[in-house]
Amino acid sequence: YSHWPSCCPSKGYPSEELLRWSTVPVPPLKPASLDFHSVSCRASEDGPLNSRAISPWRYELDRDLNRLPQDLYHARCLCPHCVSLQTGSHMDPRGNSELLYHNQTVFYRRPCHGKKGNHKGYCLERRLYRVSLACVCVRPRVMG
Amino acid sequence: YSHWPSCCPSKGYPSEELLRWSTVPVPPLKPASLDFHSVSCRASEDGPLNSRAISPWRYELDRDLNRLPQDLYHARCLCPHCVSLQTGSHMDPRGNSELLYHNQTVFYRRPCHGKKGNHKGYCLERRLYRVSLACVCVRPRVMG
């Protein structure tokens, strides 16, 4: 990462917002299958990608209002093995359903302290945060 | 998204950094298969998840030094259909290899202007940015 100039809150420019929420009026895409009323280990022939996959998964919400993004979604596999392409329901032990992980850049809001140690607004702290993105049908590892 | 209090750069607290790059000393995980010298439509029995998948993919780097994160990776499917679990090479036309997309929160750096219109450092602008995360083996949609 190249270094960006440091920057910290101030009451000096109240008309300016560092974080311009107004630039994205739409909420982040909520995964279509967040309602788990009919969650099962089968591959559908319609619906969103995660329900048509032969390694189907559901999404679980991860919310922290002091983090950007505030809402993240973690994938959770519905089957240990891959579902048969033919039937869409029977599992095939030759394939494993494995989580795909990603270290996502997030920012945590924390108190900023002035020279006298008093609370002076908000600062952001960059972190890497591990998120499971999807379940993938893979061939099992063959140990050499 | 809930609203965070506005905050903008100031020279008032030079010892504080709003964006603490130092908090993440390690670079983001580079996908292991970024070198494409032997990329082909087959599912390996070892290596990273994207090469063992029966919907294998490679990663393409998307770098923008005025964006956070500066490096993003886009998945690119290596096969139109899923690879057979049995052979790891022959394609099975009953399954499609489809890209999984995600609208990721990113931040663009732009000049901040003070009350008098002069350049006062950098502000961040939040945007949603479409990224392809992986390729998933799915059952084709059956049109009703």
Epitope: E60, L61, D62, R63, D64, L65, N66, R67, L72, H74, Y108, R109, R110, P111 | Y1, S2, H3
Partner: antibody, heavy 121, light 108 residues
Framework: QVTLKESGPGILQPSQTLSLTCSFS??????????VSWIRQPSGKGLEWLAH???????FYNPSLKSRVTISKDTSRNQVFLRITSVDTADIATYYC?????????????WGQGTLVTVSS | ENVLIQSPAIMSASLGEKVTMSCRAS?????MYWYQQKSDAPPKLWIY???NLAPGVPGRFSGSGSGNSYSLTISSMEGEDAATYYC???????????FGGGTKLEIK
Amino acid sequence: QVTLKESGPGILQPSQTLSLTCSFSGFSLSTSGMGVSWIRQPSGKGLEWLAHIYWDDAKFYNPSLKSRVTISKDTSRNQVFLRITSVDTADIATYYCARRGYDNYGGFVDWGQGTLVTVSS
Amino acid sequence: ENVLIQSPAIMSASLGEKVTMSCRASSSVNYMYWYQQKSDAPPKLWIYYTSNLAPGVPGRFSGSGSGNSYSLTISSMEGEDAATYYCQQFTSYPYMYTFGGGTKLEIK
């Protein structure tokens, strides 16, 4: 000024369903970022978080009680509800509703006075 | 699930004495919150984000710590400080608010 007040049956029998209401004023659950939790405390013991509901109806539950607990809200009436099915003596406690403060980075800033729930046959 | 262990469970201090109580987490947490509770009353938020005093909390209180280990300190014990103090942490996934078992502070 923010106030929260819990109300409930006081006493109920084992295997019955406990229904609690949290009536609040001084804030709105339609405000982005706002959320209310239910927390309980058996007499002389510690605090146990039960469930949380946000302005956008996102709901979260303590995994140890998830199968028995339901949280809901009526935004227009400034009320949050809690249901616990199949109660037994382990559910005897003072039940609090609490508002998650935003300026205080997620601590529970405002609490109700609590309502005592007893389970007895 | 992260478990918070507070120690000591009960302690007594003389007026004017320095008091320190601890809260240890079974796995690392970002921030800790502390609450004060007196008998027959709901808890009150006392310290947020590890070291920030809630409005109205006397300056003799302080909070510190990181990772697995956090503490609440009273620089000079006063009579009104006798109460039970709970630490609390939050994890966003799986979503959970966890409280410690409490430290009961009495006047010696």
